[in-house]
């Protein structure tokens, strides 16, 4: 199901309501309702690089205003690590790397930088997006997707990999971020929360959405993923927020209806090909973009993130199915599978539209708009 085109003048987090602007003041969660909902502090509140935490160790932050909410350790995801912690964990990922990147979890040991040193890098993902601080960049043209409408056969592999539900995509799905910035899609997966607890990875002005879809792409400049890891622009991810709406989303239902079959960690099923672009918002022209990292080990940097301004609507039942069907390691539910937001450390988030022009209800004081770095020129 494709979404209607968004209102032209309402950036995500701006002043009007509706699926394209879910962040009106009335939607702000209260601290006691959802203590995790606004865990990312503002960039200025974050510690310096030397204080950067391991993935699951939280940054020490200054007390926040009541409106911002507070970060609580007990609200972090606690999916257990696979296997007995006493057992040997020396099986190198793919037998070629020093770190065992198969042994990691959300919300506990081992610290992710021990799994992969890149996880302690300065330019990590996800981040908190502040539309008011985004740099309007007219050079960011509408995204181009080609070959995303797949025929029913051959079928696609849908797997519960213990960290997410992942749909492996076939060759031939081409995406362009702009002239000469061409990619091919590899896979898509989702991040979600738990009952009454949102689980998107990126946040907007501290607001966490119910869920988030990621479509991971490899630059056509590289033949293999391992060649692209850590190279600027080697990988690109399209991300969209999933929100609750009144109707069932028929595109997502093609996947969600099969989750029961892969409830067990490591299980997989085959699903008919579908229109992958129907899982994304319909407006490919309005988005935020920045350079970050993979949000799970190996946390490789140089990843171009494109976060749609428009959201995708799923029914309450569908969001419940997503967050309440799958099981992860150690007989624990696969829930809250998102990484805490990471400091920008001087990075500027760019917007393909004038996101900072519209005054948000929560803009208490004038802000200095960042200048566009002319990405894609």
């Amino acid at each position: 199901q494709r979404l209607p085109r968004m209102q032209e003048d309402s950036p995500l987090g701006g002043g009007s309501s509706g699926e394209d602007d879910p962040l009106g003041e009335e939607d702000l969660p209260s601290e006691e309702d959802s203590p995790r909902e606004e865990d990312p502090p503002g960039e200025e509140d974050l510690p310096g690089e030397e204080d950067l935490p391991g993935e699951e160790d939280l940054p020490e932050v200054k007390p926040k205003s009541e409106e911002e909410g507070s970060l609580k350790l007990e609200d972090l995801p606690t999916v257990e690590a696979p296997g007995d912690p006493q057992e040997p964990q020396n099986n190198a990922h793919r037998d070629k790397e020093g770190d065992d990147q198969s042994h990691w979890r959300y919300g506990g040991d081992p610290p992710w930088p021990r799994v992969s040193p890149a996880c302690a890098g300065r330019f990590q993902s996800p981040v908190d997006i502040r539309p008011q601080l985004a740099a309007f960049c007219p050079a960011l043209r509408p995204l181009e997707l080609l070959g995303f409408q797949l025929p029913p056969l051959p079928e696609l592999r849908l797997r519960n990999n213990g960290h997410s539900v992942q749909l492996t995509l076939p060759p031939g799905l081409e995406m362009a971020l702009g002239p000469g910035r061409e990619y091919r899609a590899l896979q898509l997966h989702l991040h979600w929360g738990a009952a009454g607890r949102p689980g998107s990875e990126h946040t907007v002005e501290g607001h966490r959405f119910p869920a988030e879809i990621h479509v991971v792409h490899l630059s056509t400049a590289f033949a293999r993923v391992d060649e692209a890891l850590g190279r600027p622009g080697g990988l690109a991810v399209l991300a969209a927020f999933l929100e609750e709406g009144p109707e069932e989303n028929s595109a997502y239902e093609q996947l969600l209806s099969r989750l029961e079959e892969i409830a067990e960690e490591g299980s997989e099923t085959q699903v008919p090909g579908l229109d992958i672009s129907a899982l994304l918002p319909s407006d490919f022209s309005r988005y935020f973009q920045y350079e970050g990292s993979l949000t799970t080990p190996p946390c490789a940097q140089g990843v171009i993130w494109t976060v749609f301004n428009q959201t995708v609507m799923l029914s309450a039942k569908q969001l419940h199915t997503l967050s309440d069907t799958l099981w992860g390691p150690g007989d624990s539910r696969l829930q809250l599978n998102f990484r805490a937001t990471q400091p920008l450390n001087g990075r500027v988030i760019e917007a393909s539209f004038p996101a900072g022009v519209d005054s948000s209800p929560r803009a208490a004081e004038p802000v200095q708009l960042n200048s566009c770095l002319a990405a894609g020129d």
Epitope: P82, G83, N91, L186, G266, S267, P329
Partner: antibody, heavy 125, light 107 residues
């Protein structure tokens, strides 16, 4: 370097259950993304995939053998096992264990990148 | 089940020859195909994955091509150690299935 080693009786009587074990050394069977397979090869013939198991216990069997096959895993011993019931002479084969890795980033299977050396099982009275 | 048909079932060639083995899938398997080499009394060894990616440590004289239903393994210059049986494997959908094999013999 991960290595696989099959073990079990080389001779099984018809109608009985064939039992084989594959021991994984040089790495943990519980590593995420790794699937552990059984494959067989009839004398002078081609290869037939029997099924896989994940450390969580999740399995997938070849439908042609599903009614007779059970694959199990013992993470404490770093082993996985094959049981094939009601065997006949047609089950005489070399049985191999092999590993598949699903890359978390691509979702693509690295199919049968490592194999055991195989063990010959004869079904005969 | 997806049927994998290899041809020829056997061939005779000399050292230095260029050898081509074909594998046909009964339905579209995209590039979800691997090639394996097996010598007598030994376990198979993977040569090619994803239809055309050479396994590390495998001589560059081996190459794979194709996608959809038609796939080819080529040995550009046959070496004495290349005399063996070659199998294709589809891992597009379960049950994963192998071709029946191609035996490459010395002429």
């Amino acid at each position: 370097q991960v290595q696989l080693q099959e073990s079990g009786p080389g001779l099984v009587k018809p109608s009985q259950t064939l039992s084989l074990t594959c021991t994984v050394s040089g790495g943990s069977i519980s590593s995420g993304g790794y699937y552990w397979n059984w494959i067989r090869q009839h004398p002078g013939k081609g290869l037939e995939w029997i099924g896989y198991i994940y450390y969580s216990g999740s399995t997938y069997y070849n439908p042609s053998l599903k009614s007779r096959v059970t694959i199990s895993v013992d993470t404490s011993k770093n082993q996985f096992s094959l049981k094939l019931s009601s065997v006949t002479a047609a089950d005489t084969a070399v049985y191999y264990c092999a590993r598949t890795y699903y890359d978390i980033l691509t979702g693509y299977p690295d199919a049968f990148d490592i194999w055991g050396q195989g063990t010959m099982v004869t079904v005969s009275s | 089940d997806i049927q994998m048909t290899q041809s020829p079932s056997s061939l005779s060639a000399s050292v230095g020859d260029r050898v081509t083995i074909t594998c046909r899938a009964s339905q579209d398997i995209r590039n979800d195909l691997g090639w394996y080499q097996q010598k007598p009394g030994k376990a198979p060894k993977r040569l090619i994955c994803a239809a055309s990616s050479l396994q590390s440590g495998v001589p560059s004289s081996f190459s794979g091509s194709g996608s959809g239903t038609e796939f080819t393994l080529t040995i550009s210059s046959l070496q004495p150690e290349d005399f063996a049986t070659y199998y294709c494997l589809q891992h597009n959908s379960y049950p994963w299935t192998f071709g029946q094999g191609t035996k490459v013999e010395i002429k």
